[in-house]
């Protein structure tokens, strides 16, 4: 069996507590890409494949995922987040098929994570997309992030 990430509250539990009862299920769009996903081709498939996966920092203990996918095709998305050096410590999230972005809180600071995602269409899994990214290293990173956010806000433009 696999064990949960060793922290006060698992990422999946924290995510669910924060988002699962709210209508705007983590739909924020992110910038500042830290990791890019390549298509994890798994043989010939007759299902549409996910497009691109981007992972960026959110604060010191979170990651933001953005992905592209055909509209109205997906029943669910399933996401796995695991520390790169801890194969057994994985968290899974199952999300509605309408989402194209999600924030994942409750991770360890300054830690590399591998993020994987697939979609479910007509009851079958699509190929897996994966990317690697690290959470921020602490207060300096948060301060920088806030500075950039303020700067972007006052000049009304965003970097993508």
């Amino acid at each position: 069996g696999s064990t949960a990430i060793g922290m006060k509250e698992t990422a999946a539990a924290k995510f669910e507590r924060q988002h699962m009862d709210s209508p705007d299920l983590g739909t924020g769009g992110g910038s500042g890409i830290e990791g890019r996903g390549s298509m994890g081709y798994r043989g010939s498939e007759d299902l549409p494949q996910l497009g691109d996966l981007a992972v960026s920092e959110v604060g010191w203990d979170g990651l933001r995922l953005n992905w592209t996918a055909a509209d109205n095709a997906y029943e669910h998305f399933v996401i796995q987040v695991q520390e790169v050096n801890k194969v057994e410590a994985a968290q899974n999230l199952t999300l509605p098929g309408s989402l194209r972005a999600v924030d994942i809180p409750g991770l360890e600071a300054a830690t590399p994570y591998r993020v994987s995602i697939y979609g479910v269409i007509r009851g079958y899994r699509t190929p897996v997309l994966s990317a690697e990214a690290s959470t921020a290293s602490g207060l300096n990173d948060i301060f920088e992030a806030q500075k950039i956010e303020w700067h972007e806000g006052t000049h009304h433009h965003h970097h993508h």
Partner: antibody, heavy 118, light 108 residues
């Protein structure tokens, strides 16, 4: 560490229904998939269907479509499998199991024996 | 539903033998395949997922390979504890899917 505890053995009459429960502890119940698998005496494993508790949506194997209903109660972290129109061939051990990211069933309940006999 | 066919249905082997079990899918399932070990009166135990990924705590003598429609489970050097029944399962279906009919590994 995830643990799945199932309800006790059942003896049922042909034509009746049975409802087996599976209580989960550890991990985040709503976010993972629960499958139901059965095994008749001396036979192999049969996947019956599964559910994602967070959405309540279930998928079923064709063989059991229309006769099985899988549900989940997030408030009690419990999944249920109800099989109707029981016949003697439904005598089996019924297991619940948790699926990992790739669909492999990594944690299993202890099994519930259902005997269908007149 | 996708059909899974395992061979052989019974395999007689000795301790130390290299054992290979084959599983064939009725259509391509990419690498969405798991292998299980089951002993009498016990729940199955996950050995391999994603066709070739070893489940945590499973001895490295177990390995899986294949993609598409043809898959194999190999036990590099059979141990006394390995005499059991082995099942493959396709996981292209969500959240899980059909099993093969099983392969019983018995003492020669």
């Amino acid at each position: 560490q995830v643990q799945l505890v199932q309800s006790g053995a059942e003896v049922k009459k042909p034509g009746s229904s049975v409802k087996v429960s599976c209580k989960a502890s550890g991990g985040t119940f709503s976010s993972y998939a629960i499958s139901w698998v059965r095994q008749a005496p001396g036979q192999g494993l049969e996947w019956m269907g599964g559910i994602i508790p967070i959405f309540g949506t279930a998928n079923y194997a064709q063989k059991f479509q229309g006769r099985v209903t899988i549900t989940a109660d997030k408030s009690t972290s419990t999944a249920y499998m109800e099989l109707s129109s029981l016949r003697s061939e439904d005598t089996a051990v019924y297991y619940c199991a948790k699926g990992n990211f790739y669909g492999g069933l990594d944690y299993w309940g202890q099994g519930t024996t259902v005997t269908v006999s007149s | 539903d996708i059909q899974m066919t395992q061979s052989p249905s019974t395999l007689s082997a000795s301790v130390g033998d290299r054992v290979t079990i084959t599983c064939r899918a009725s259509q391509s399932i990419s690498s969405w395949l798991a292998w299980y070990q089951q002993k009498p009166g016990k729940a199955p135990k996950l050995l391999i997922y994603d066709a070739s990924s070893l489940e945590s705590g499973v001895p490295s003598r177990f390995s899986g390979s294949g993609s598409g429609t043809e898959f194999t489970l190999t036990i590099s050097s059979l141990q006394p504890d390995d005499f059991a029944t082995y099942y493959c399962q396709q996981n292209k279906k969500f959240p899980s899917g059909t099993f093969g009919q099983g392969t019983k590994v018995e003492i020669k």
